[in-house]
Interface confidence: medium
């Protein structure tokens, strides 16, 4: 760029001089250098202006990207407060059931235990009844009326 | 820095020159000025170009991380929507097992009652096998054959 | 801005000259833009180096709320991972509540089937109670005793 | 933790009856609770058995129609009345959760005398 | 009923050393479903009966494993690895598998 171009020309004026005037060379030279440094300077300003308004229009576009991911990220820190709470309800419906099982678990048993001193209970009249059974006579006649009929006859 | 330093040098200029001719003094003053000035905008152009290079280096790297945030906080989002649908589910499924607990509990009152019928019916059964028990004859021998063998004898 | 003014006066200086010394005015327009050029640098420098400054500043609001927005998704990911194992864990007590009601459904049938037998068997008894009921004697003395009675009157 | 806690000792006249309460405490529904009683320096002997959750009873030969077992669900406290008492039925009256006895009361002392 | 009968009846043994009470049945203990309904208690002095052992050979909670039950059938046994002070009182085998339940007569456990 113009503005890089070191300006050591500058130094070049007379550096012996004879005169206490000043060349019309040396001022043009002199002019030359202020009409390029004008002109880089200018460039530069140009160019600074439209990079940093550039940066600005980056970070406004920055800005808004951030405040809607932000909002988004409120929003999923929001619906999993949500979905926490949701899961909690479901552990505490779970645990309901839980015990709902347990307790119906626990009827179950105690009805099993019934069964079984009811099943026992029938085992026992069985075995009385069988045992009546097997006492009743075989025959319709009883021995001591046979011979009976025996010492009479 | 040298840009910060006043020109205000310039103005001492042959303030009331007599001759039409500059001084080479005041055309080296010039010189010096603009070499100064050359300079200070040589520094500070490329201090600047440096700072913005940063600032668009920087603006990159953010540009490349707000891009992953955005990709992970979608990932969350869509993760938490999987969430929210197994979570869904869950509830289905915690109702499901929850009604299931309740049909177990209606057929468990309903065999109770069938249980306590039965038991019941067991009980009515031991009363008429002990009543039966009891009308049973003590002895093997019947009175009416004894009171017979005696009138007979 | 001053800097924005061509400096193209330079150009007038002198182009056919009759002499070899500057001039003196020619020198003044020669300080004069040196004077501007200087004045708009240094305004531009200072209104760079505040832009420039606020960029920073900005960007360094921004990398702050950055780290945080990144915090809060790292937590949220957290956070979302920890309500995944809740989730599976729930899960798995929900199997394992179904698992039980299937089991206590199962031992419910089981016990059903038990009670029909059961309820078989009570009936079985009860036919045989009635059957030893019906085969007793209707009256204390028995039909052989009568006939043995007649036969020795 | 499963507790069973009786009413306090009794005094009765031959011919009298006596009921003995037995309150449940600590676990989960419905169980059977079974009556056991021991004579002064005597073994064990069954007696019979109530559901807590059916009031369903049941109770050995020996004291079929003198023993009545009742249940108050309210309260989760059992009760056993034994009627037409006799010197002999001097003793100690427990209660035991289940159909196998797995927890026991502290027992209430029954004094038959004239 | 079904008759159960322990012995011996009174059981003298030195601390640390092992003890065993045997229990018989009139009739076999085995129920239709398969399990033997066989109890163990211990009562000691002046408490309430506190079950050891059911179902022939499971340890309630709490019970020291000290204290283990055998047997099948007709035939069981209780037995202390070593009897310990706190072992001291009577112990009853029970059986729940016939209607009505019954008990045996007790073993009274002392030191020597």
């Known amino acids: 760029s113009r503005i890089d171009q070191d300006n050591s020309s500058f130094d070049s004026l007379s550096p012996e001089p004879k005169s206490r005037f000043a060349m019309l060379d040396d001022v043009k030279i002199l002019a030359n250098g202020l009409l390029q440094l004008g002109h880089g300077l200018k460039d530069f300003v140009h160019k600074t202006k439209g990079q940093i308004n550039d940066i600005f229009q980056k970070l406004n576009i920055f800005d808004q990207s951030f405040y809607d991911l932000s909002l988004q990220t409120s929003e999923i820190k929001e619906e999993e407060k949500e979905l926490r709470r949701t899961t909690y309800k479901l552990q505490v419906k779970n645990e309901e059931v839980k015990n709902m099982s347990l307790e119906l678990n626990s009827k179950l048993e105690s009805l099993l235990e019934e069964k079984i001193l009811l099943q026992q209970k029938v085992k026992y009249l069985e075995e009385q009844l069988t045992n009546l059974i097997q006492n009743q006579p075989e025959t319709p006649e009883h021995p001591e009326v046979t011979s009976l009929k025996t010492f009479v006859e | 820095s040298r840009i910060d330093q006043d020109n205000s040098s310039f103005d001492s200029l042959s303030p009331e020159p007599k001759s039409r001719f500059a001084m080479l003094d005041d055309v080296k003053i010039l010189a010096n000025g603009l070499l100064q000035l050359g300079h200070g905008l040589k520094d500070f152009v490329h201090k600047t170009k440096g700072q913005i290079n940063d600032i668009f280096q920087k603006l990159n790297i953010f540009d490349q991380s707000f891009y992953d945030l955005s990709l992970q906080t979608s990932e969350i989002k869509e993760e938490e929507k999987e969430l929210r649908r197994t979570t869904y589910k869950l509830q289905v499924k915690n109702e499901e097992v929850k009604n299931m607990s309740l049909e177990l509990n209606s057929k468990l009152e309903s065999l109770l009652e069938e249980k306590i019928l039965l038991q019941q019916k067991v009980k009515y059964l031991e009363e008429q096998l002990t009543n039966l028990i009891q009308n049973q004859p003590e002895t093997p021998e019947h009175p009416e054959v004894t009171s017979l063998k005696t009138f007979v004898e | 801005s001053r800097i924005d003014q061509d400096n193209s006066s330079f150009d007038s200086l002198s182009p056919e000259p009759k002499s070899r010394f500057a001039m003196l005015d020619d020198v003044k327009i020669l300080a004069n833009g040196l004077l501007q050029l200087g004045h708009g640098l240094k305004d531009f420098v200072h209104k760079t180096k505040g832009q420039i400054n606020d960029i920073f500043q900005k960007l360094n609001i921004f990398d702050q709320s950055f780290y945080d927005l990144s915090l809060q998704t790292s937590e949220i990911k957290e956070e979302e991972k920890e309500l995944r194992r809740t989730t599976y864990k729930l899960q798995v007590k929900n199997e394992e509540v179904k698992n039980m009601s299937l089991e206590l459904n199962s031992k419910l049938e089981s016990l059903l089937e038990e009670k029909i037998l059961l309820q078989q068997k009570v009936k079985y008894l009860e036919e045989q109670l009635t059957n030893l009921i019906q085969n007793q004697p209707e009256t204390p003395e028995h039909p052989e005793v009568t006939s043995l009675k007649t036969f020795v009157e | 933790q499963v507790q069973l806690v009786q009413s306090g000792p009794e005094v009765k006249k031959p011919g009298a009856s006596v009921r003995v309460s037995c309150k449940a405490s600590?676990?989960?529904?419905?169980?059977?609770i079974t009556w056991v009683r021991q004579a002064p320096g005597q073994g064990l002997e069954w007696m019979g058995w109530?559901?807590?959750?059916?009031?369903?009873?049941d109770s050995a030969p020996k004291f079929q129609g003198r023993v009545t077992m009742t249940t108050d669900t309210s309260t989760t406290t059992v009760f056993l009345e034994l009627r037409s008492l006799r010197s002999d039925d001097t003793a100690v009256y427990y209660c035991?959760?289940?159909?196998?006895?797995?927890?026991w009361g502290q027992g209430t002392l029954v004094t038959v005398s004239s | 009923d079904v008759v159960m009968t322990q012995s011996p009846l009174s059981l003298p043994v030195t601390l640390g050393q092992p003890a065993s009470i045997s229990c018989r049945s009139s009739?076999?203990?085995?129920?239709?479903?398969?399990?033997?309904?066989l109890n163990w208690f211990q009562q000691r002095p002046g408490q309430s009966p506190r079950r050891l052992i059911y179902?022939?050979?499971n340890r309630d909670s709490g019970v020291p494993d000290r204290f283990s039950g055998s047997g099948s059938g007709t035939d069981f046994t209780l037995k202390i690895s070593r009897v310990e002070a706190e072992d001291v009182g009577v112990y009853y085998c029970?059986?729940?598998?016939?209607?009505?339940?019954?008990f045996g007569q007790g073993t009274k456990l002392e030191i020597k």
């Open positions: 035991a959760r289940g159909r196998l006895f797995d927890y």
């Open positions: 600590g676990y989960l529904s419905d169980f059977i």
């Open positions: 109530i559901s807590t959750y059916s009031g369903d009873t």
């Open positions: 009739q076999s203990l085995v129920y239709s479903d398969g399990n033997t309904y």
């Open positions: 179902k022939v050979s």
């Open positions: 029970m059986q729940g598998t016939h209607w009505p339940y019954t």
